[in-house]
Amino acid sequence: QTSVSPSKVILPRGGSVLVTCSTSCDQPKLLGIETPLPKKELLLPGNNRKVYELSNVQEDSQPMCYSNCPDGQSTAKTFLTVYWTPERVELAPLPSWQPVGKNLTLRCQVEGGAPRANLTVVLLRGEKELKREPAVGEPAEVTTTVLVRRDHHGANFSCRTELDLRPQGLELFENTSAPYQLQTFVLPATPPQLVSPRVLEVDTQGTVVCSLDGLFPVSEAQVHLALGDQRLNPTVTYGNDSFSAKASVSVTAEDEGTQRLTCAVILGNQSQETLQTVTIYSFPAPNVILTKPEVSEGTEVTVKCEAHPRAKVTLNGVPAQPLGPRAQLLLKATPEDNGRSFSCSATLEVAGQLIHKNQTRELRVLYGPRLDERDCPGNWTWPENSQQTPMCQAWGNPLPELKCLKDGTFPLPIGESVTVTRDLEGTYLCRARSTQGEVTRKVTVNVLSPRYE
């Protein structure tokens, strides 16, 4: 009878084991072990027992002891079970950002590991078990589906293998994959709201505001604002689930034309964009041109109004004929035209909006001097000793200098309050003088003596 000890062994891969083969007869013709494993016999006294060191055990094996005794041949097997932890425990790669509401499939792959009967694969969220399955196949694959929720944001998903050899008197061997950190997000299907001027004048500033609600996590949202090819640097204000990005836009002559204003919001691996057209225009005020800003009475004056080539002008309320960017009027300058305003109003249509610009010029008409009965009466009769104010107004542009003299020396105090005396009586020559010439007018003052009764 042949026996073997131990009859069952569990050992780590590549390990060694001592196996004793024994026989019941005293003088066996043959005693040995049959195995493909490297073996080394340890010398022992006696013929009915042999000890072998079996080394570099890589896989399960069944070495067989045999003996040949006078009463016949017999064998005995020992069962070597090799254990080893998996060489690879890996979660299939996934995009780190996942939209809330999406079904996320977690796939764990396990290569190697034995004995498979004792090997379990566990999928976890944090420490919470999502799925537990025995490792089957090579590589073993375990999958589970997770409905992505907002509160999963920042959660770590991992895969763990458990090689449980506690029933065999050993321990529980665990291997864990690198964690996959889930970033969940919500980017609404509605595009961002963009508020900006539809038209903007060259060399001015405008304000652009881009906003969006219903974002999660709002702090991770990237906002890109651009006008044409110009990056705008917005100031972003965050709410609980919203943001508002405000930027100032300065435009120059280089920006003249139609530009695309874009606001793009990027969150996770998704983006939403709003596009708006902004027309940047150049529209200088119209030019009012007078032949001469200062003319003498009776001179022909041309007033011209010139504006942007696409503008339509009106001059003193009269539209250009034909309607267009130029208008003019002709007049013969009269004193009444002095200080007259010529106003040109130009209207330009920019992207459906009417833009108005005005320019005004004043005409100076040189005339006079004038002395007439209405403003400088030729006759005054005043009671002696009364208080009177001699009035004589000379007209003209420039305003004439006025002097009224009696006998070339005695002045009439124009515009001053005087006590009427006999000396005041007489005929005065009033002379109005300006760069335009001079005029004279005789003024007679009569003094009435008081009657004494």
């Epitope: 002559a253 034309g257 139609t258």
Partner: antibody, heavy 119, light 109 residues
């Protein structure tokens, strides 16, 4: 569709003058800025000049300032480049291109016209 | 010297991805536009703004930017993509209205 067709290129002696034209169709000419870009044979692209849609603003590269004049006739849908005091280094293919705004990228290009300055 | 710097030449295997870059200070303020020029032809706009393609340009062309560098990426390069590529931007120095890079010759192997 948008079409830009340059003309007026040819052989000219150093110091001479030439006027290039670019006939445009397929878009609202007066709403678009226009530019001239040149390319010396076997070399890269070089921006030359630009003009706003209204014609009120013009821009020139330093290399041509004072010698070249850009203009446009919106009634004829035509862009011009008057070149004077020409030099050998002005030899190039001259392309006209349009952009939605004066300083903007070039949406469409013409096929180009060759200007050769040589004695 | 050009104010936008490009590699003179780049090659890519058929069907592979290639990135052409353009560097310049103005790219911190302005987006680059990219033009393709095949031999004997006029340039054609392929990318403008942050990453916009004109109609008719295949979606294998894409643009991106970071700091002072703009990139044109061709994902799955085709034989017909062999051409010169020029980046172009507004000139932030104010000397010129727009400025071109020196160009990159793309060879599809």
């Amino acid at each position: 569709q948008v079409q830009l067709q340059e003309s007026g290129g040819g052989l000219v002696q150093p110091g001479g003058s030439l006027r290039l034209s670019c006939a445009a169709s397929g878009f609202t000419f007066s709403s678009y800025a226009m530019s001239w870009v040149r390319q010396a044979p076997g070399k890269g692209l070089e921006w030359v000049s630009a003009i706003s849609g209204s014609g009120g603003s013009t821009y020139y590269a330093d290399s041509v300032k004072g010698r070249f004049t850009i203009s446009r006739d919106n009634s004829k849908n035509t862009l011009y480049l008057q070149m004077s005091s020409l030099r050998a280094e002005d030899t190039a293919f001259y392309y006209c291109a349009n952009s939605a705004y004066t300083g903007g990228w070039y949406d469409y290009w013409g096929h180009g016209t060759l200007v050769t300055v040589s004695s | 010297a050009s104010e936008l710097t490009q590699d003179p030449a780049v090659s890519v295997a058929l069907g592979q991805t290639v990135k052409i870059t353009c560097q310049g200070d103005s790219l911190r303020t302005y987006y680059a536009s990219w033009y393709q020029q095949r031999p004997g032809q006029a340039p054609v706009l392929v990318i403008y703004g942050e990453n916009s393609r004109p109609s008719g340009i295949p979606d294998r062309f894409s643009g991106s930017s970071s700091g002072n560098t703009a990139s044109l990426t061709i994902t799955g390069a085709q034989a017909e993509d062999e051409a010169d590529y020029y980046c172009n931007s507004r000139d932030s120095s104010g000397n010129h209205l727009r400025v071109f890079g020196g160009g990159t010759k793309l060879t599809v192997l």
